[in-house]
Interface confidence: low
């Protein structure tokens, strides 16, 4: 008698390895003999399709090498023209052992930043990561953490994250383990002992120690006035990433000597710096405020400005004297905010000038102050209408810093060449005679408030410079 | 918009146990530790623990050892504390807190008032 | 235990300066944040890692750290500025974090 189809044996979940042989059976019970078909996610598999072996009538159904991507809902469908078809369906669930598609690779990071270990997997079920550091596992803290991709982060990078690390992926099919990478910690330059200052008798011999650290080692160079060094031994040892640098030194003269530490970071590099002044005993005279050397302008903002290689006092109450006052210069002309042309060149001279003052050498190197009356030419008649704002802003409180209160000279505080043409130096820029003065509009209404006497003429044009940098 | 939610106000009696959450929106939620963050009435604040949510792992400070139990919810994006034993002494505000990227707690719960009285 | 110590309260005028100190030994080898609490509220963070600000917060706000102290300061002091702060470090060496005991700042 003729029966419909019924499925006796409905599909069940499959799981299967990777690589791995699957078979759904579908068992059939009907007359006459069903015709069974197969989908896989509602799409009809071909009998001739080599990935598959269809066998007993289309009962079972086996894929030969399963891969990822056969994971789905497989479906029979029975039919023998009596009665409807029929249908039963499982789903093939893909196992995978773990396996690492982004592994780690080695990373140099400097101390104090984030570093980023990757650790992308696959595998079903899905794999957990860990991390190997050395031959322990690592474990985790407020700085140190696995994300869910399994890559490892750490926050603020130490030297004792450096090392060597590995990820470790993990479902219950097995393990998979990355290569082993490594993690540099490099740490910028930093010097942990700061050569001292010395006052000696003329003739001593005076070592200076620098000792310093990073990674990579710094290398340590000594600077003299602002010149490599030229005389004296140097000695150095390096132990555990700190290197050790002695200069000696057979003192004839004063000077400030300068280590720098410098160590490079991929294309960068990281330096640190620390000074100390040799003074000689006998040099010593009471001025207090005159300890420095004259060394020739190697600057940048006043070469316009300044004679061509103009011997100028540098102040070793800076550690940097050349740096620092180069800065005080620059911070001057950008706290000036609006300019006019008139003052402009007036102000870089007059700045230049007291900043980099003129140097007289001698047994005690003195500074040469400007001459009051270039001051006040400065002050009452070029940049009278800019001096009055910026006195302003100074009592309002108004400027970032308090450096341009250094920048800007008290011109009655001067000497005035009227009482020792030596001692007191001229702004050769401002040289004028009184048919110049026609020239320029008035810039205040008010008479100036102190004579501005006649300065000496000069045969250079009275507005020669060209600023370096502008004021406004 | 970043927002850490946390459970309303409990009324607890000694010996009890609480469970507080705090649910986590407008960032991944297993990317950052949650911490736990208590403040007793006119007192400071007192961190108790995190845990990383990816992972599970957790640590307690040396206080709570043994009382404290923090757990998460990856599919929810919740993170729960739960305090057994409870004392008067427990009565505070519980908060929880994390740190988008930096190692300090720049984003905070609006804390939940637990209250132990007999 | 790590332990941090901070004075109860400052008071200061407005317009004034307002220094919070935040003593702990060798703290200026840890990264020092400072959190701002009014009441009623879950606490702020004003300053991270030493001197860092989240954005929002203004640059009134500022911190310092070295050797066995670290600083708050709040310069021009606005009435709005009122709240308790707390200092808070990670302790490298016990792997917890550790609050100070909070400062009121009260403003005249």
């Known amino acids: 008698l003729p029966k419909a189809p019924v499925i006796t044996t409905p599909l069940e979940t499959v799981d299967a390895l990777v690589e791995e042989v699957a078979t759904f059976m579908c068992a059939v019970e009907s007359y006459p003999q069903p015709e069974i078909s197969w989908t896989r996610n509602k799409i009809l598999i071909k009998l001739f399709d080599t990935r598959y072996s269809i066998r007993e009538n289309g009962q079972l159904l086996t894929i030969l090498s399963v891969e990822d991507s056969d994971d789905g809902i497989y479906c029979c469908t029975a039919n023998n023209g009596v009665g409807g078809a029929v249908e039963s369906c499982g789903a093939l669930q893909v196992k995978m052992k773990p396996k690492i598609t982004r592994p780690p690779i080695n990373v140099k990071i400097i101390e104090g930043l984030k570093a980023v270990l990757p650790c992308t997997t696959m595998g079903n079920p899905k794999p957990s990561v860990s991390w190997i550091k050395g031959d322990s596992p690592l474990r985790e803290n407020s700085r140190i953490a696995v994300l869910e991709s399994g890559s490892l982060r750490i926050h603020n990078v130490q030297k004792e994250d450096a090392g060597q690390y590995r990820c470790v992926a993990k479902n219950s099919l097995g393990t998979a383990y990355s290569k082993v990478v490594k993690l540099e910690v490099e740490v910028f330059a930093r010097i942990l002992r700061a050569p001292e200052s010395h006052n000696v008798t003329f003739g001593s011999f005076v070592t200076l120690h620098c000792t310093a650290t990073g990674i990579p080692v710094p290398t340590i160079t000594w600077i003299e006035n602002g010149n490599a060094v030229s005389s004296g031994s140097i000695q150095e040892s390096v132990k555990d990433r700190v290197i050790d640098s002695r200069l000696q030194l057979f003192i004839t003269k004063p000077g400030l000597y300068t280590c720098i530490a410098t160590n490079k970071h991929g294309e960068k590099f990281s330096t640190a710096k620390a000074a100390a002044t040799i003074s000689i005993a006998e040099w010593s005279k009471p001025q207090k405020d005159n300890k420095g050397y004259c060394a020739q302008y190697r600057g940048e903002v006043c070469n316009a400005v300044l004679a061509k290689d103009a011997l100028v006092f540098l102040n070793t109450s800076y550690a940097d004297p050349e740096e620092a006052q180069e800065l005080l210069v620059h911070t001057a002309w950008n706290e000036l905010k609006v300019v006019s042309p008139v003052c402009r060149p007036a102000a870089e001279a007059l700045l230049c000038n007291h900043i980099f003052q003129e140097c007289s050498p001698g047994v005690v190197p003195t500074p040469i102050p400007i001459c009051r009356e270039y001051c006040l030419a400065v002050k009452e008649l070029f940049c009278a209408k800019e001096w009055l704002v910026m006195e302003e802003k100074t009592h309002r409180g108004l400027y970032r810093s308090e450096m341009h209160l250094l920048s800007v000279p008290e011109c009655s505080k001067l000497p005035s060449m009227h009482w020792d043409p030596t001692a007191c130096a001229r702004l050769p820029h401002l040289d004028y005679n009184k048919e110049n003065l026609k020239t320029f509009p008035p810039m205040t209404s008010s008479k100036p408030s102190v004579d501005i006497p006649n300065l000496p003429s000069s045969s250079s044009s009275s507005f020669s410079v060209s600023p370096t940098y502008s004021m406004t | 918009q970043v927002h850490l939610v946390q459970s309303g106000a409990e009324v607890k009696k000694p010996g009890a146990s609480v469970k507080v959450s705090c649910k986590a929106s407008?960032?991944?939620?297993?990317?950052?530790?949650m911490h736990w963050v208590r403040q007793a009435p006119g007192q400071g604040l007192e961190w108790m623990g995190w845990?990383?949510?990816?992972?599970?792992?957790?640590s307690y400070a040396q206080k709570f050892q043994g009382r404290v139990t923090m757990t998460r919810d990856t599919s929810i994006s919740t993170a729960y504390m739960e305090l057994s034993r409870l004392i008067s002494d427990d009565t505070a505000v519980y908060y929880c807190?994390?740190?988008?990227?930096?190692?300090?707690?720049?984003?905070w719960g609006q804390g939940t008032m637990v209250t132990v009285s007999s | 235990s790590y332990v941090l110590t901070q004075p109860p309260s400052v008071s200061v005028a407005p317009g004034q300066t307002a220094r919070i100190t935040c003593g702990g030994n060798n703290i200026g080898s840890k990264s020092v944040h400072w959190y701002q609490q009014k009441p009623g509220q879950a606490p702020v963070l004003v300053v991270y890692?030493?001197?860092d600000r989240p954005s929002g917060i203004p640059e009134r706000f500022s911190g310092s750290n070295s050797g066995n102290t670290a600083t708050l300061t709040i310069s021009r002091v606005e009435a709005g500025d009122e709240a308790d702060y707390y200092c808070q470090v990670w302790d490298r060496s016990s792997d917890h974090y550790v609050f100070g005991t909070g400062t009121k700042v009260t403003v005249l």
């Open positions: 890692d030493d001197s």
């Open positions: 807190a994390s740190g988008l990227g930096i190692s300090a707690f720049d984003i």
């Open positions: 407008g960032y991944t939620f297993t990317g950052y530790y």
């Open positions: 845990i990383n949510p990816y992972s599970g792992g957790t």
